[in-house]
């Protein structure tokens, strides 16, 4: 028998520095977790102790903190090279800055193979990108070889900006011939490494013949065997065993997100490449693991540019940006409108002639808006200003919801109106009218939504049985502020871009902003 140790990360999302337990900015260093310096310590410790080790990343290194905003992927290449990753799969967020924003900083600079079997380049891009990413790579490990085949969510054109010259094929259809090719090359130990979410990971394990192990990402799935070491609740055992259609027992793993854990899977293969045992658990990268001093010093060196960036002007406002709780928790506020407009703008994807865009709606809990921005400072808006408005380091995500769920959400928005509670919703692409004289749960008297399948966008009444795409904070997608109905009833959830980054990009693009209060939210009684 031959033993392989697979170390894996996924959805790190720019968490190069250590973070707090909830993966936001580290405040109390003695309680902080993750970060590349700490990760390196643990990886090196395992490499020294065990003979056959692979360090793999399942995508979405890009996007999530000011590190990505400033360095645009150069930081990913630099620190992944320093950690000596063996391979990476492309995630949807790797395309956030377009194909050029992937090629130049990452694909050309990475000293490890970057993989995806289901992305096919066409047109002029085909020759430009040729060889910079691969469908698979055969890696020598000790005396053996291991095949790694990559895959990426086929939803990427709706979630990011890959352009028109990349075709995202069905994962299973694309993977099978590549795995077959590896088999003909006499490679009998094959890992599928990719970024399509846990459900697709399990489907790949079930359907793609010849795959021995699946290492996934995208859904931030936490798997654990035994008592979990932190706040994350396991979605299943680690590894999660899937019985393939032909009867193989295929371990499937994922390691939550944000570099908080290092996935650790030990696989035993027989001489024919059969998996005869698999066990392990994610390792919590808490403060009991010291940060590697040389990587930490490098991080501190790269940090300097971030501090300078946060005080630079992004754009100007010529109006007061009312982000006060007195406004945003009680009525339509122009800061809410600004943020929602930025959220929709960030998700413009003209992928179908029938639709002006795939999504037109935004909802945003008023309690998530933490500060106004005064225009009487020469109108200047900085990253620092926006960090005061959106201090929680969240993301603006894409969900699919039924109209009936949206109706419940808007009822929840005003179920205890008047108490300055955070669940009051700010909106974009939605016109809502409340009647507060009615009993809670029955206060939404009009709810119109902006069409998407139209050449001239207009507002139509919400249909209860229709499925709508909505952009919202990850906080709401996870049921925060009492929006349990969103968490329980959402039909799809894809994590999006860092909240501050979305707004800062929009302001930089617009140069001068002047958001108004324009009647998105109305009250049919009282003095509102």
């Amino acid at each position: 028998a031959w033993e392989l140790t697979i170390l894996h990360t996924n959805d790190v999302h720019s968490r190069l520095e250590q973070t707090s337990e909830d993966s936001s900015k580290c405040v109390n260093a003695s309680r902080c977790m993750g970060g590349v310096a700490r990760l390196f310590t643990k990886v090196q410790q395992i490499r020294r102790a065990e003979p056959n080790v692979l360090l793999l990343d399942a995508g979405d290194q890009y996007q999530g903190t000011i590190w990505f905003t400033v360095y645009k992927g150069a930081e990913v290449a630099h620190f992944m090279n320093a950690l000596r990753y063996d391979a990476m799969a492309l995630g949807n967020h790797e395309f956030d800055n377009g194909v050029e924003g992937l090629i130049e900083p990452l694909l050309k600079e990475a000293k490890f193979p970057i993989l995806s079997a289901n992305i096919k380049a066409k047109g002029p891009l085909a020759s430009q990108i040729s060889g910079l990413y691969l469908p698979y790579k055969v890696l020598p490990v000790g005396d053996e070889v291991v095949g790694i085949v990559g895959y990426t969510s086929k939803e990427t054109p709706f979630l990011s900006n890959p352009g028109t010259n990349l075709v995202f094929e069905d994962e299973i259809t694309a993977l099978q011939p590549e795995v077959d090719k590896l088999k003909t090359l006499n490679v009998n130990k094959i890992i599928a490494l990719g970024h399509s979410g846990f459900e697709m990971d399990k489907l790949i394990a079930q359907k793609v013949r010849g795959v021995d192990v699946v290492v996934g990402g995208h859904s931030n799935t936490f798997l654990y065997t035994g008592n979990p070491p932190s706040k994350e609740v396991p979605a299943g055992k680690y590894p999660f065993i899937v019985t393939s259609d032909d009867g193989r027992k295929v371990p499937v793993v994922q390691a939550y997100a944000f570099g908080k854990y290092l996935g650790y899977l030990k696989i035993e293969f027989d001489e024919r490449g059969n998996v005869i045992s698999s066990h392990g658990n994610p390792i919590l990268l808490n403060s009991s693991i010291p940060e590697d001093p040389s990587i930490k010093a490098d991080i501190n060196k790269w940090r300097i540019k971030l501090d300078n960036y946060s005080t630079q002007e992004l754009g100007k406002t010529i109006v007061y940006l009312d982000g006060s709780s007195q406004s945003c928790r009680f009525r339509e506020c122009n800061m809410g409108n600004l943020i929602c407009d930025a959220m929709i703008n960030n998700n413009l994807r003209h992928t179908d002639e029938m639709f002006w865009n795939h999504v037109s709606m935004c909802i945003l809990n008023g309690g998530g808006i933490r500060s106004p921005i005064d225009e009487r400072n020469n109108g200047t808006i900085t990253w620092e200003n926006l960090a005061a408005v959106l201090p929680f380091g969240g993301t603006f995500d894409l969900v699919q919801l039924k109209g009936s769920t949206l109706k419940k959400a808007f009822e929840h928005s005003v179920h205890r109106y008047g108490q300055s509670t955070g669940e009051f919703l700010q909106v974009g692409g939605i016109h809502v009218v409340y009647d507060l004289s009615r009993k809670p749960g029955d206060r939404v008297v009009k709810l119109d939504v902006l069409c998407t399948k139209c050449r001239v966008p207009s507002y139509d009444p919400l249909k209860m049985d229709e499925v709508y795409k909505v952009i919202l904070p990850n906080f709401l997608a996870n049921g925060g502020d009492g929006f349990q109905m969103i968490k329980d009833e959402l039909l799809r959830h894809d994590s999006g871009d860092q909240d501050i980054n979305v707004v800062s990009t929009y302001i930089s693009k617009m140069k001068v902003i002047y958001p108004a209060v324009e009647g998105r939210i109305k009250f049919s009684t009282g003095s509102h």
């Epitope: 077959d180 088999k183 019985t243 009867g247 027992k249 059969n274 045992s277």
Partner: antibody, heavy 119, light 107 residues
Framework: QVHLQQSGAELARPGASVKLSCKAS????????MEWVKQRPGQGLEWIGA????????RYTQEFKGKATLTADESSSTAYMQLSSLASEDSAVYYC????????????WGAGTTVTVSS | DIQMTQTTSSLSASLGDRVTISCRAS??????LNWYQQKPDGTVKLLIH???RLHSGVPSRFSGSGSGTDYSLTISNLEQEDIATYFC?????????FGGGTKLEIK
């Protein structure tokens, strides 16, 4: 050295049941499927079904559902096949074999157990 | 179910001959074709898996080839100990199925 030791010949009456055993040694019993194959006198080989001792998962060909029941005992590294409602057409040699999922070949075979159904 | 057909049920050859045994599948089995040898005493051994890969310990005079639906087993230099019945088996789609066998005899 991988070895599969099968139980001795069985003589049974029509309508009765028999339970054949296959004791594995020299490998991790719970990590491989145990396949069962039937061969009637002068005939070819016919796959009956298989069991994965690691989790008790089983699969059968349509013809043997209800006829064969596969079980495994991890502690003794032994796989069992019970054949019920025996009839003359069940008279055959029954082999156990280790299933190799790399190519779904059967890489090690037992010597076979002869079952004779006769009144 | 996939049908496996060995059209030649018996074959006579002389020692030292090159012998080819064929096997046809009712549909494409993507090279998941395995060959077994059953000796007159009933002992069964795997010879070749995945069309052409020699199982460990099997003499190099045995070889396999084919693709799609048509496959063959070749014994390059027939020896006395090769007198046996040879079965093909597809491992592409459940349920696994075997050919009817080809009995090899000495002329």
């Amino acid at each position: 050295q991988v070895h599969l030791q099968q139980s001795g010949a069985e003589l049974a009456r029509p309508g009765a049941s028999v339970k054949l055993s296959c004791k594995a040694s020299g490998y991790s019993f719970i990590s491989y499927w145990m396949e069962w194959v039937k061969q009637r006198p002068g005939q070819g080989l016919e796959w009956i079904g298989a069991i994965y001792p690691g989790d008790g998962d089983t699969r059968y060909t349509q013809e043997f559902k209800g006829k064969a029941t596969l079980t495994a005992d991890e502690s003794s590294s032994t796989a069992y096949m019970q054949l019920s409602s025996l009839a003359s057409e069940d008279s055959a040699v029954y082999y156990c074999a280790r299933g190799n999922w790399d190519d779904w070949d059967f890489d090690v075979w037992g010597a076979g157990t002869t079952v004779t159904v006769s009144s | 179910d996939i049908q496996m057909t060995q059209t030649t049920s018996s074959l006579s050859a002389s020692l030292g001959d090159r012998v080819t045994i064929s096997c046809r599948a009712s549909q494409d089995i993507s090279n998941y074709l395995n060959w077994y040898q059953q000796k007159p005493d009933g002992t069964v051994k795997l010879l070749i898996h995945y069309t052409s890969r020699l199982h460990s310990g099997v003499p190099s005079r045995f070889s396999g080839s084919g693709s799609g639906t048509d496959y063959s087993l070749t014994i390059s230099n027939l020896e006395q100990e090769d007198i046996a019945t040879y079965f093909c088996q597809q491992g592409n789609t459940l349920p696994w199925t075997f050919g009817g066998g080809t009995k090899l005899e000495i002329k």
